[in-house]
Amino acid sequence: QRFAQAQQQLPLESLGWDVAELQLNHTGPQQDPRLYWQGGPALGRSFLHGPELDKGQLRIHRDGIYMVHIQVTLAICSSTTASRHHPTTLAVGICSPASRSISLLRLSFHQGCTIASQRLTPLARGDTLCTNLTGTLLPSRNTDETFFGVQWVRP
Amino acid sequence: QRFAQAQQQLPLESLGWDVAELQLNHTGPQQDPRLYWQGGPALGRSFLHGPELDKGQLRIHRDGIYMVHIQVTLAICSSTTASRHHPTTLAVGICSPASRSISLLRLSFHQGCTIASQRLTPLARGDTLCTNLTGTLLPSRNTDETFFGVQWVRP
Amino acid sequence: QRFAQAQQQLPLESLGWDVAELQLNHTGPQQDPRLYWQGGPALGRSFLHGPELDKGQLRIHRDGIYMVHIQVTLAICSSTTASRHHPTTLAVGICSPASRSISLLRLSFHQGCTIASQRLTPLARGDTLCTNLTGTLLPSRNTDETFFGVQWVRP
């Protein structure tokens, strides 16, 4: 019982339970393939507990191994559209600091209109994650079709 | 050492480790797009630790942020079948209480025969999750092809 | 504060935080559909904390419920390639001990070039997981396109 109380009394952040789930805010201007995200209870079911948004990109606040997940659905899309506009690709990576820049997760749409995946990866405090959508098709802003999140798993 | 002992002595439920993995039981009668789920060690590798089933739908017992995941594969399906029967769509949402009704996760099959995704979402005690499959194609009942689960992540 | 300190002082393994993320090493010889994996910080962003590799296959060291996830992308692939070489199927299962052999997760590529999914499943110490790719197409070795991992979730 004492442990359960201690668990409740301690701020959750000290337990390392950093977590975020974001919804699409907007796409970037031309030549900027990045998706711009937003989160917070006022927006619906998105939230940030630990990580922060920096100009629409997700910045990590705690070192550790994270589960990163994403789903992106293309707007006004059919398998014909998707194949005609191929290649449309989504990549999630560390975009800053530049010294740690790397692609973590990459998927192409081919004849589908939705990609969804997840992976475990080490992230460090200050890492900023970017999600790049290349191609001419646009992502849906529906919150049940396009979302991006991270969950701290262990140190 | 004391913490490890405390952790073992406390019932897991008090740590908030609610988790469930379900297998398909059956589809609904006509006009009911819901999938009906089942779980328990007697059925194979499905289980419920915390959440419960209410007439084949998953009911949450603990407030918190959950990772919700699902995979649904269509029975007797090829890319030709899938495109001919388009649109076939899978949506996961809170279906009761009505005041909290919302779609959490939505995917279309397009030319594929399997959808799989996951997301983080806040759920409250008493929320019932429904999985709606719309279209004329039927889901496979193979336990390695069709499954649905939740995992409590943090308060 | 005491709990946070205790948490830091205890070896993470005693908290049951077993986790692994692997990258593709190579495919098997003819007639062996298994993918062979590798992991470790020297290789990039892959790692093993608890589980071990046994001849390229992942062996579990702690009983519990695990989240198993995988993404496999086919090399030199288009939707035309994928449909022409159909069926190409990926299955994740327990392959040893033989008494516990079972398929946990199965997906076909149909007209797509990437599959990605995840599921919760009970695993026991000594279980070895195999990932079988059947068909004539080969998987990409890019670390952001093909990966396989497990995360201990609860006892």
């Epitope: - | 398909l24 059956h26 589809t27 009668p29 006509q30 029975a75 004329t136 039927l138 009942r141 | -």
Partner: nanobody, 113 residues
């Protein structure tokens, strides 16, 4: 105890037709998704055709255009019409309540060339 019983199998020449029937001892067919599976010698059982309670049906690509699944809820029957049979269709055919582990004993279909 609900039982399923298949009939209509037999020996037929390539290009010929057969109609398999499946009857249930209770009104289970009316309320359930029904399926036909087949198992060829030395192979795994495979799903061939499926039909939902409303009559919407689907058959495997390997038999598309040749096999048709149908149901008669009033008679509590499900059928598999097999035309233009090929030697590779040789197998034991099973009727199944798809979302329940309820199976018939099977009926042998042999297609000679």
């Amino acid at each position: 105890q609900v039982q399923l019983q298949e009939s209509g199998g037999g020996l037929v020449q390539a290009g010929g037709s057969l109609r398999l029937s499946c009857a249930a001892s209770k009104s289970i067919i009316r309320d359930n998704v029904m399926a036909w599976h087949r198992q060829a010698p030395g192979k795994q059982r495979e799903l061939v055709a499926i039909i939902n309670t409303g009559g919407s049906a689907n058959v495997d690509d390997s038999v598309k255009g040749r096999f048709t699944i149908s149901r008669d809820n009033a008679k509590n029957m499900v059928y598999l019409q097999m035309n233009n049979l090929k030697p590779e269709d040789t197998a034991v055919y099973y009727c199944n309540v798809y979302y329940r582990d309820l199976w018939g004993q099977g009926t042998q279909v042999t297609v000679s060339s």
